[in-house]
Amino acid sequence: MGKSLSHLPLHSSKEDAYDGVTSENMRNGLVNSEVHNEDGRNGDVSQFPYVEFTGRDSVTCPTCQGTGRIPRGQENQLVALIPYSDQRLRPRRTKLYVMASVFVCLLLSGLAVFFLFPRSIDVKYIGVKSAYVSYDVQKRTIYLNITNTLNITNNNYYSVEVENITAQVQFSKTVIGKARLNNITIIGPLDMKQIDYTVPTVIAEEMSYMYDFCTLISIKVHNIVLMMQVTVTTTYFGHSEQISQERYQYVDCGRNTTYQLGQSEYLNVLQPQQ
């Protein structure tokens, strides 16, 4: 209560004592809560705007002789009595302000949730882009460098980082090649990027019979079925997410081939022209 004095238009005189001015103080809305003034410094006062509110009009408060000053020592000793009907106790826009604040908070929260809510990152394996083949005649080994294409779509309203891509190629349930790409790219909000990655593969040893097939040049197309596996790791807000895809693809092991995107998926295995 004492703190609110500094915001109230009341005055008191530094020489007012409790017993001498009680009725006047009470009438004017000031009560001395102490018997005497503990602060004896005369010049140490605080300046406040002053109005005495009687209910009808404003008059000079005799408690402080109209000086508009309350001695500093009495700041915490005087209590203001204000009529309940004082409009200043009831600001007209409080509800409006509260409602507006709540609405703004809800709006901001909703927008934050809408824009920051994690959405899916779509990974679409498009297919084999090219396959470059070489042979080791001595070892009866086939080396295939297979370049694949991925489409990665970011459905979020913020950028995501494609941290790494790990890929492996299987032939006849045997892993013949692996690759890993790190720190690849950053995909912007609602953006899509096409990423090419190459997997070096080796067909050898117990699969050396494939060498006979792939180097049999009386066949025009030496299609072999490979299983492409790819795992894309993306990060956003420190959160890591992995998306995997598997696809069977035809690859020509008999010659260097560049494919139209998606073409290698639908090729039929052609028969030799003998």
Epitope: Y135, Q138, Y209, D212, F213, L216, S218
Partner: antibody
């Protein structure tokens, strides 16, 4: 271990149809890039391709003899058959069957069967 | 057809010395895939032919490394570094590049 063995009548009369059989073991003719071929060698002369059959049942015949040759296979029995129609004395030779492959050529050969065309 | 040409006889060689056998093709046997489709076979007296070398330079399994092969697209040489008595026979070159596959006439290795 890959083995091939040819069998035939030994002697046939001119204008008859000759049937030869190649029985093999140690490999499968269902494997990609594998096949079996027939080669013949007249006495004291060089080698001549006759026909070949591949894992996918595709067949090839030496162009000059194509009209007289028929090659077939029974994969379940691991056997290859060659028929030569309308034989004459020029067909007298040792007939070999060999396992063939695109990369390695005729890597394994049978011991051969000698055919004599005689009236 | 691709014609494979060989001399009927080699120069007589002494056991333990090296020997060379030549073969020529009527067309380059080097394919666009980098492989040369030339093969060497040895037929020992009274036996079936056996594969020595496939695709110009690859030694067949079980063949001693005394044998080696080289050449360009059309001219090829089979080398035997130390000739042994068991090497005697007829050496055939062959091509698998085009249909029909064809053999050379064969070169007989003769000893001095």
């Amino acid at each position: 271990q890959v083995t091939l063995k040819e069998s035939g009548p030994g002697i046939v009369q001119p204008s008859q149809t000759l049937s030869l059989t190649c029985s093999f073991s140690g490999f499968s003719l269902n494997t990609l890039g594998r096949g079996v071929g027939w080669i013949r060698q007249p006495s004291g002369k060089g080698l001549e391709w006759l026909a070949k059959i591949w894992w996918n049942d595709d067949k090839f015949y030496y162009p000059a003899l194509k009209s007289r040759l028929t090659i077939s296979k029974d994969t379940s029995k691991n056997q290859i058959f060659l028929k030569i129609a309308n034989v004459d004395t020029a067909d007298s030779a040792t007939y070999y069957c060999a396992r063939i492959a695109g990369g390695t050529g005729a890597a394994y050969w049978g011991q051969g069967t000698t055919l004599t065309v005689s009236s | 057809d691709i014609v494979m040409t060989q001399a009927a006889f080699s120069n007589p060689v002494t056991l333990g010395t090296s020997a060379s056998i030549s073969c020529r093709s009527s067309k380059s046997l080097l394919h666009s895939n980098g492989i040369t489709y030339l093969y060497w076979y040895l037929q020992k007296p009274g036996q079936s032919p056996q594969l020595l070398i496939s695709q110009m330079s690859s030694l067949a399994s079980g063949v001693p490394d005394r044998f080696s092969s080289g050449g360009s697209g059309t001219d090829f040489t089979l080398r035997i570094s130390r000739v042994e008595a068991e090497d005697v026979g007829v050496f055939y070159c062959a091509q698998n590049l085009e249909l029909p596959w064809t053999f050379g006439g064969g070169t007989k290795l003769e000893l001095k």
